[in-house]
């Protein structure tokens, strides 16, 4: 039921013109000498959206992005000329495209750019308090950006900065061939994935990186990387892409002899997002485009939302799959992928697995292995030759929660908001596309939580011209969505309740968890407000029961809650 016909037609379809006229979009149309507004950093406390672009870093006011400050950070003429002489495009490549923008500490951001094929990093001062109104480049302190930002602006970096250390998945060379997951900055020696070993990484494209605690002991914290890569030979006939989740222990300092300054706890598993097809052949959505982690109550167990597209040029489609961290951990505790030679098939490893199990974080509570440098040789050699798990991670309910195959666009980005409604909590997805539209979709549980119905609430065009949405952030505080593309940035509210019409029935039929009928208009629903005066039914969208002649008061007394 994940492609239910009536639910796949948006309740509201708003053109860019309609969005503007109804004051539902604010746009920053970019600067003449900049582009590629792709790197977002949301700071709810300061009420700022920091954006890395071509030769610029911006600080936008979350209330209204028309209010912004900018830092100009171009490359020197010499660098630009060197880049041009190397045969690169002066406009599209020989500039400083910002790829990393992270909070470094209370007063500074850390930023890295391509530097015209010569990656460079620096610190940006933002001050202690929002009212300081400081936003300036630390001109005296530039660092080599190799292993932090790619050389090529077409490539992405997945990065995470925690405790003064930068984890980044990127290409570390001019040619864009040496892809690796790095840890740099901090006081320790830089660490990376094994070089020139396709079993570890096989021409990957990194999507994002996230710290997810494993237990209440911080020694067990892991960093997870999401990426797509070429399937390893013998894993698939012909050239294929696989979506991956990779794990690394935060306290991995490399091996003592083998894997020196290399990860010893790196493991990866395939993420499956597929639908059963005719003749028993599944249709796979393998091109991972974006990931969003929905943290709710338990930081150890976020729900992972992934946006995928098909690899095929003939059949174009997009899907959203959800994954649970318990399923991910189960796969990482399962069999390792193993093969005896280049011409053999991959099989589950059935030999003796050394102790401590490769991929386990060293901790005093776990066998007394204080550091990865303390691991015996057999653990390191096994880890080196068995980076991949045999079993894949299947999505919750073993299928996508949403697919789109009958449209002229593909999904590119996703953010999710958890909304309290009258009849329970709902996850509302905002999905960006490659034509500059945003889909607003609500997941509605049916008989069980795992069985979800997707209702497409809105389809909004947020840019004047069709353009690929390359970044999205959601501010729960401001109840706004921020969208990045090559052309510029758009800001829109998460809800447009008044657009659903002037009648209770229309408001109810919308099934928008943000909205409820208050007796006179369709407006924002707040769970703290008196329930007696609100009409809303997300689960069933039934106006007959909820908007009866008996009035809202009478209806509410007999309403059954679904939790």
């Amino acid at each position: 039921n994940y492609q239910n016909g009536k639910n796949n037609v948006p309740r509201l379809k708003l053109s860019y013109k309609e969005m503007l006229e109804s004051n539902n979009v604010i746009t920053f149309n970019g600067l003449a000498n900049s582009s590629s507004y792709h790197t977002f950093l949301l700071d709810e406390e300061r009420s700022r959206l920091y954006v890395g672009a071509k030769d610029h870093i911006f600080s936008f006011n979350l209330v209204n992005i028309k209010d912004f400050q900018k830092i100009v950070w171009p490359v020197s003429y010499t660098r630009r000329d060197e880049c041009k002489w190397a045969g690169k495009d002066i406009l599209k490549e020989c500039a400083n495209f910002i790829k990393v923008l992270k909070a470094y500490n209370q007063t500074h951001l850390y930023a890295c750019g391509t530097g015209a094929f010569h990656p460079i990093c620096t610190y940006i001062e933002i001050g202690h308090h929002p009212e300081d109104n400081i936003f300036k480049l630390e001109n005296s302190h530039f660092e080599n950006g190799r292993g932090k930002s790619p050389y090529d602006p077409k490539l992405l970096t997945a990065s995470l900065l925690i405790d003064g250390e930068l984890y980044s998945g990127t290409a570390a060379d001019f040619m864009g061939r040496d892809f690796a997951i790095f840890r740099t900055l901090g006081h320790h020696h830089p660490i990376r994935t094994e070089q020139h070993d396709s079993r570890w990484l096989n021409d990957p494209r990194f999507i994002s990186a996230h710290l997810i605690p494993e237990s209440d002991n911080p020694e067990d914290d892991k960093v997870y990387f999401f990426f797509r890569e070429n399937a390893i030979d013998g894993e698939h006939s012909g050239k294929a892409t696989h979506a991956r989740i990779g794990q690394i222990c935060k306290n991995d300092f490399g091996g003592h002899r083998s894997l020196v300054n290399k990860w010893t706890t790196f493991l990866k598993a395939r993420l499956i997002c597929s639908v059963p097809g005719p003749n028993g052949i599944d249709t796979h959505f393998d091109e991972l485009q974006d990931v969003f982690l929905m943290n709710f109550k338990d930081p150890k167990n976020p729900i992972v939302y992934g946006v995928f597209t098909t690899s095929s040029n003939i059949f174009k489609g997009s899907a959203v799959c959800m994954y649970s961290m318990s399923d991910v951990r189960r796969v990482f505790l399962g069999p390792y992928a193993h093969r005896d030679g280049p011409n053999y098939q991959w099989v589950p490893y059935q030999g003796r697995v050394p102790y401590p199990r490769p991929g386990t974080c060293p901790s005093k509570t776990f066998g007394g292995f204080d550091s990865t440098k303390d691991l015996p040789d057999d653990v390191i050699t096994f880890a080196r030759s068995h980076p991949a798990m045999y079993n894949p991670v299947f999505p919750i309910n073993n299928r996508p929660i949403m697919i789109k195959t009958d449209v002229n666009y593909q999904f590119t980005q996703i953010v999710v908001d958890r909304v309290d409604a009258e009849d329970g909590q709902y996850d509302v997805m905002f999905i960006g596309t490659d034509v500059g539209t945003v889909l607003k979709v609500v997941s509605i549980p049916k008989e069980t939580w795992h069985d979800l119905e997707e209702v497409l609430l809105e389809e909004m065009t947020v840019f004047r011209e069709p353009t690929t949405i390359s970044a999205m952030e959601l501010s729960t505080k401001q109840q706004q969505l921020y969208i990045g593309s090559t052309a510029g940035i758009a800001q829109l509210p998460l809800h447009r309740c008044d657009i659903y019409g002037k009648a209770c029935a229309e408001c109810c039929l919308a099934r928008d968890p943000y909205c409820a009928w208050d007796g006179s208009s369709c407006s924002r629903y707040f769970p703290t407000a008196k329930a007696r005066t609100r009409a809303q039914d997300i689960r069933n969208g039934d106006p007959l029961t909820h908007c009866s002649d008996g009035g809202i008061e009478g209806r509410m007394d007999h309403h059954h809650h679904h939790h």
Partner: antibody, heavy 117, light 107 residues
Framework: EVQLVESGGGLVQLGGSLRLSCAAS????????MSWVRQAPGKGLEWVST????????YYPDSVKDRFTISRDNSKNTLYLQMNSLRAEDTAVYYC??????????WGQGTTVTVSS | EIVLTQSPATLSLSPGERATLSCRAS??????LHWYQQKPGQAPRLLIY???QSISGIPARFSGSGSGTDFTLTISSLEPEDFAVYYC?????????FGGGTKLEIK
């Protein structure tokens, strides 16, 4: 200079117990894996056990598993081997060895254990 | 477990000659192989670690080579004090195992 001095060897009855000790000096004891290796009369070398730096985990071959226990006291720079349910085939010279994470680079002079029936 | 087979069991040579001792593993062990020398009534001492890495204090005439399953300890020119028993040991996986030894004797 690295020094490893074993003690506690001797004659023991079949099925009996014995505890070997090894006093280490000349290096940072807590920074290294430590091992015991034995050599039966006129025979080759046989690895008996290895303990990690913190003492939190140890490795054994099947031949001694569940009978021998290696332990260490990093505050005293001392390594131990508790041997229970001794068998005739446990008769050997027992060497205390520095290392076991990689190569075993320093060996004590050994202590003799004789199991008699 | 990984079985190490040393050959020959006994090697009879004269001082000044070149000695080549072999150690074969039952499965590939990379370069996780160490060589030890033991003289009668003495404890073993480490000669070569990780197949080919030399140790300070060990004469340069001792060298090691090989990886995977076949390893060699070479003594370029035998000195009288080199006549002893030589053991190889794998550190690739637990349980650690030693070869049966090669006795190098004076011809």
């Amino acid at each position: 200079e690295v020094q490893l001095v074993e003690s506690g060897g001797g004659l023991v009855q079949l099925g009996g117990s014995l505890r070997l000790s090894c006093a280490a000096s000349g290096f940072t004891f807590s920074s290294y894996y430590m091992s015991w290796v034995r050599q039966a009369p006129g025979k080759g070398l046989e690895w008996v056990s290895t303990i990690i730096k913190s003492g939190g985990y140890a490795y054994y071959p099947d031949s001694v598993k569940d009978r021998f226990t290696i332990s260490r006291d990093n505050s005293k720079n001392t390594l131990y081997l508790q041997m229970n349910s001794l068998r005739a085939e446990d008769t050997a010279v027992y060497y205390c060895v520095k290392g076991g994470q990689g190569a075993m680079d320093y060996w004590g002079q050994g202590t003799t254990v004789t199991v008699s029936s | 477990e990984i079985v190490l087979t040393q050959s020959p069991a006994t090697l009879s040579l004269s001082p000044g000659e070149r000695a080549t001792l072999s150690c074969r593993a039952s499965q590939s062990i990379g370069d996780y192989l160490h060589w030890y020398q033991q003289k009668p009534g003495q404890a073993p001492r480490l000669l070569i670690y990780y197949a080919s890495q030399s140790i300070s204090g060990i004469p340069a005439r001792f060298s090691g080579s090989g990886s995977g399953t076949d390893f060699t300890l070479t003594i370029s020119s035998l000195e009288p004090e080199d006549f002893a028993v030589y053991y190889c040991q794998q550190g690739y996986s637990f349980p650690y195992t030693f070869g049966g030894g090669t006795k190098l004797e004076i011809k």
